[in-house]
């Protein structure tokens, strides 16, 4: 006569987190009398998942009616699966007794849980950096399973190659995390640029998750200065302009100095934006030449985004009859601020 066999037909079952897992088990005989129990793991530390005889197992339901007279199907469904449920499940037949004794075990079914990675979070450097500098961006995503995952970096759609990625932990775990650091060389045109971290995983069905960082939060483009003398507006008056070009971010303070003495300080307000996201600004200074007997050194001093000031000077000759000494060749529209100095 054939002895009872416990059949677990599935070697492995893979389930998405949040779904229900069905673990199949049938027995070939009703002999001996005694309950079926399900365990996660083997050995003395195994965890009881379901006992046909007694106990309360709120997440477990029997697939077929376990009280049915000739029932030999002891498959179970475990609801609301989480990565913590991963492991090998054994269907075990016990023989009635005091206590019940283990009679025969199935071969086991390995349950793997497919858990989606969290939305990648990209973070850049704490301080702004200027073009030509290399900055690091980090990307993190957590809680995924299985461990296999693909991470790519892009800058404005172009794939980056200079990055390092780690998946933790190295050994077996219920879920995993990924951490990647990419190096990006900044250019003056990067105000509108984006760095993208893209994560692909089996749970995402070909639709990867993306995290982005705007380089506008990272880059500082220092201004270029040009001081020019405009044509005479009136007798004894000269108009000097300081063109502040291609700067980012907008935070900027300009100071005019006459022969080293502060003449006026102003904050950039009505700026114009270039296509590349940088800003231009222009400040005017109206100088009354008749008030000066010697030549005047005019200095435009700019403090940008809390950085050390940069300046550009222009020598105004008062001995010569005022004439045009320079012209504005900038193609951009410019804002204006006008002050008269007497």
């Amino acid at each position: 006569e054939e002895e009872l066999q416990v059949i677990q037909p599935d070697k492995s079952v893979s389930v998405a987190a949040g779904e229900s897992a069905i673990l199949h088990c049938t027995v070939t005989s009703l002999i001996p009398v005694g309950p079926i129990q399900w365990f996660r793991g083997a050995g003395p530390a195994r965890e009881l998942i379901y006992n046909q005889k007694e106990g309360h197992f709120p997440r477990v339901t029997t697939v077929s009616e376990s009280t049915k007279r000739e029932n030999m199907d002891f498959s179970i469904s475990i609801s609301n699966i989480t990565p913590a449920d991963a492991g090998t499940y054994y269907c075990v037949k016990f023989r009635k007794g005091s206590p019940d004794t283990e009679f025969k075990s199935g071969a086991g079914t390995e349950l793997s849980v497919r858990a989606k990675p969290s939305a990648p979070v990209v973070s850049g450097p704490a301080a702004r950096a200027t073009p030509q500098h290399t900055v690091s961006f980090t990307c993190e995503s957590h809680g995924f399973s299985p461990r296999d995952i693909t991470l790519k970096w892009f800058k404005n759609g172009n794939e980056l190659s200079d990055f390092q990625t780690n998946v933790d932990p190295v050994g077996e775990s219920v879920s995993y995390s990924i951490h990647s650091t990419a190096k990006v060389v900044l250019t003056r045109e990067d105000v509108h640029s984006q760095v993208i971290c893209e994560v692909a995983h089996v749970t995402l069905q070909g639709d990867p998750l993306r995290g982005t960082a705007n380089l506008s939060e990272t880059i500082r483009v220092p201004p270029t200065l040009e001081v020019t003398q405009q044509p005479v507006r009136a007798e004894n008056q000269v108009n000097v302009t300081c063109q502040v070009r291609k700067f980012y971010p907008q935070r900027l303070q300009l100071t005019w100095l006459e022969n080293g003495n502060v003449s006026r300080t102003e904050t950039a307000s009505t700026v114009t934006e270039n296509k590349d996201g940088t800003y231009n600004w222009m400040s005017w200074l109206l100088v009354n030449v008749s008030a000066h007997r010697d030549d005047v050194k005019l200095t435009c001093q700019v403090e940008h985004d809390g950085q050390p000031a940069v300046s550009k000077s222009h020598d105004l000759k008062v001995s010569a009859h005022p004439k045009e000494q320079g012209s504005n060749t900038a193609a951009e529209n410019t804002g204006s601020n006008e002050r008269n100095i007497y």
């Epitope: 006569e1 070939t28 005989s29 001996p32 309950p35 009635k96 007794g97």
Partner: antibody, heavy 115, light 111 residues
Framework: RQLVESGGGLVQPGGSLRLSCAAS????????ISWVRQAPGKGLEYIGT?????ITYYASWAKGRFTGSKTSSTAYLQMTSLRAEDTAVYYC????????????WGQGTLVTVSS | DIVMTQSPSSLSASVGDRVTITCQAS????????LAWYQQKPGQAPKLLIY???TLATGVPSRFSGSGSGTDFTLTISSLQPEDFATYYC???????????FGQGTKVEIK
Amino acid sequence: RQLVESGGGLVQPGGSLRLSCAASGFSLSSHGISWVRQAPGKGLEYIGTIGTGVITYYASWAKGRFTGSKTSSTAYLQMTSLRAEDTAVYYCARGSAWNDPFDYWGQGTLVTVSS
Amino acid sequence: DIVMTQSPSSLSASVGDRVTITCQASQSVYGNNDLAWYQQKPGQAPKLLIYLASTLATGVPSRFSGSGSGTDFTLTISSLQPEDFATYYCLGGGDDEADNTFGQGTKVEIK
């Protein structure tokens, strides 16, 4: 699906008897067969269950004198050292109890122990 | 060994009556539910009515129901029918697989 007993009859005290229980409509391979007896005018009394070779068990009072066996189609109950108080109708039933109750019963066979 | 005590040993009732028979075990039955009820008519083999304390066997009318757990169990016939006049036995199982004992029976007679 039915069970049919045979082998009952008159036997002298101290004698032996083998009862048969033939199954039709199902195989006994995956089922236990239990034996129950009922003395005239009395209640039901559980004797034991025959599962497989390893899994055979008897009520404490029946151990030693009663032995069961079965094939895929027939179960047997061997009774020895019979006494007058063993006089009863003997039933075989499919099942081992608990979640495998006695759902199909034979018609019973009368065993009379008398000199 | 487990001892099953049925009460009453006999009762008289009329068709349409609600009938209740109790069975008490000397110790908790196996799994708190190893209790079956059988019906036996004169000259016939017993018939399974209820198992696992409350599960109705196939083909048994729904007027029969079982309840209870541990040591105290009840068989209820909600509306007695003429064919229900018979003797009813409970069968309780202890923790040992051979420890199966019938109650002494309850005879339901026509009033």
